[in-house]
């Protein structure tokens, strides 16, 4: 009874032996192949890992656990059947062979068997719980993986969509760039063609201008000749009239020819009694060379020799060094008297310079320099000014000290650029300086923001092109 032993037989079946007095009871129980033997150590946390398992691994292990559970279940069922069968047989045997007092032993054995069964069942339940626990964990992980996968898939889809959009945009932009490049090439070709045409046109115009200049020179010469002839004719007529009157009044027909008087400047003309504004012939100092100049006999006491006038844009002031030297234009309109004459004139005595200006709003102003002269050509007709007064600015708009004269073909300024070519006209440019009264003539409403216009900075600023200008000189002791 108390001698209860458990062992394994040679074929791997579990063997239960109960010794009670002279009787010995042996129970043979089948052992499932896939079940863990009770003697093998059981690690309860073997399947409960913290680190997530690889998906395929988890599925595989789950299948193994399911198989184990199924096998355990089958084993239990077999055990129950076996016990029932054995119990029936044993009961029959006991009823037939054993004495009544063996019943208690049998009950005890049954109880033990039931206890064993219960233990096995508890263990199986424990395994099942663990399997369920692990299954739940795996299911959660699978769910998490699934969600994560979905999220990643969504992100990938979004990114793919974004990439597609960008690719579309890129291809659109590429097309646009190519189109622009094509357009640009066409425009460049067009500009080049235009440039070539303009160059042809410019060269044509240059040749036309040269022809016109030649014609103008010829016309001027012819005009001078005609004027001289007219003057000589008038003189002859006057002489004839004098002769006629003399021959009528006296018997002695001797003609007293009037001595020809020459004037150096308009001050001398004025002092000789000619007090009307107009064009007069002046003579170079210490020379017989003559020049025509406009004399202002009214403004500020008269006697002013006009050396420059701008009023309507009728004369081109972008001229050569030689033209600025000898003078150009029409003395009754726009003209430049000539640097050589002014240099020689101001070399003889002290002169004052008055610059009279008009804007497009009806305002007038002037700058008066008490001392003025031009150096010789050798010193590039450098301007010398001193003693500024007047209403056209307290600071001189002609840079001080004076600068050399510059033209399109005679660059004597203090700029690395060529001021005369850039701003047009000949002038005493600095670099390039606050004035240029020989700049481009701009009509009204086109006269602002012009860097190359008729400029007098300290009266109207840098971008304002004036309506009219007059530069005039007179001896300081007039």
């Amino acid at each position: 009874y108390n001698n209860f032993r458990k062992s394994m037989d040679s074929i791997g079946k579990k063997q239960y032996q109960v010794q009670h007095g002279s009787c010995s009871y042996t129970f043979l129980l089948p052992e499932m192949d896939n079940c863990r033997s009770s003697s093998s150590p059981y690690v309860s946390n073997a399947v409960q890992r913290d680190a997530p398992l690889e998906y395929d691994d988890s599925v595989q292990r789950l299948q193994v656990l399911e198989n184990i559970m199924e096998n355990n279940t089958q084993w239990l069922m077999k055990l129950e059947n076996y016990i029932q069968d054995n119990m029936k047989k044993e009961m029959v045997e006991i009823q037939q062979n054993a004495v009544q007092n063996q019943t208690a032993v049998m009950i005890e054995i049954g109880t033990n068997l039931l206890n064993q069964t219960a233990e096995q069942t508890r263990k199986l339940t424990d395994v099942e719980a663990q399997v369920l626990n692990q299954t739940t964990r795996l299911e959660l992980q699978l769910l998490e993986h699934s969600l994560s996968t979905n999220k990643l898939e969504k992100q990938i889809l979004d990114q793919t969509s974004e990439i597609n959009k960008l690719q579309d945009k890129n291809s659109f932009l590429e097309k646009k760039v190519l189109a622009m490049e094509d357009k640009h090439i066409i425009q460049l070709q067009s500009i080049k063609e235009e440039k070539d045409q303009l160059q042809v046109l410019v060269s044509k115009q240059n040749s036309i201008i040269e022809e016109l200049e030649k014609k103008i020179v010829t016309a001027t010469v012819n005009n001078s000749v005609l004027q001289k002839q007219q003057h000589d004719l008038m003189e002859t007529v006057n002489n004839l009239l004098t002769m006629m009157s003399t021959s009528n009044s006296a018997k002695d027909p001797t003609v007293a020819k009037e001595e020809q008087i020459s004037f150096r400047d308009c001050a001398e003309v004025f002092k000789s009694g000619h007090t009307t504004n107009g064009i007069y012939t002046l003579t170079f100092p210490n020379s017989t060379e003559e020049i025509k100049a406009y004399c202002d006999m009214e403004a500020g006491g008269g006697g002013w020799t006009i050396i420059q006038r701008r009023e309507d844009g009728s004369v081109d002031f972008q001229r050569t060094w030689k033209e600025y030297k000898v003078g150009f234009g029409n003395p009754s309109g726009e003209y430049w008297l000539g640097n050589e004459f002014v240099s020689q004139l101001t070399n003889q005595q002290r002169y004052v310079l008055k610059i009279h200006l008009k804007d497009w709003e009806g305002n007038e102003a002037y700058s008066l320099y008490e001392h003025f002269y031009l150096s010789s050509e050798e010193l590039n007709y450098r301007i010398h000014l001193k003693g500024l007064t007047g209403t056209a600015g307290k600071i001189s708009s002609i840079s001080q000290p004076g600068n050399d004269f510059s033209t399109k073909d005679g660059d004597n300024d203090k700029c690395i650029c060529k001021c005369s070519q850039m701003l047009t006209g000949g002038w005493w440019f600095d670099a390039c300086g606050p004035s240029n009264l020989n700049g481009m003539y701009y009509p009204q409403r086109q006269n602002t923001n012009k860097f190359n216009g008729i400029k007098w900075y300290y009266w109207k600023g840098s971008g304002y092109s004036l309506k009219a200008t007059t530069m005039m000189i007179r001896p300081a002791d007039f």
Epitope: R350, Y373, S375, R382
Partner: nanobody, 120 residues
């Protein structure tokens, strides 16, 4: 281009004499007025004497300084006698207008100057 080169300057005892020369190169200056100016340290440029093409002259110290010119040699001279320590300065030669003037404004060609030092 016209250039004026002065010479004849140097160190001299008070009461002594010096003759400055100014030679023009580049072109003839027979019609131009030629003048002498001087500038002492810390002072403004001062007129000394001038001579026209025809030989008319004006000076600030007639008794001591005499200006003359040789148009053939294209040269102007300044004879300085009875020199005083206050005559110490850099002496400049200048060419200007055809009219006589003491105003340096009307002289547009200048030499580099020559130092005259009068010691007491």
């Amino acid at each position: 281009e016209v250039q004026l080169v002065e010479s004849g300057g140097g160190l001299v005892q008070a009461g002594g004499s010096l003759r400055l020369s100014c030679a023009a190169s580049g072109r003839t200056i027979s019609s131009s007025v030629l003048g002498w100016f001087r500038q002492a340290p810390g002072k403004e440029r001062e007129f000394v004497a001038a001579i026209s093409g025809s030989g008319s002259s004006t000076d600030s110290a007639k008794d001591r300084f005499t200006i003359s010119r040789d148009n053939a040699k294209n040269t102007v001279y300044l004879q300085m006698n009875s020199l005083k320590p206050e005559d110490t300065a850099v002496y400049y030669c200048a060419a200007g207008r055809a009219f006589l003037t003491r105003d340096p404004f009307y002289y547009d060609i200048w030499g580099q100057g020559t130092q005259v030092t009068v010691s007491s």
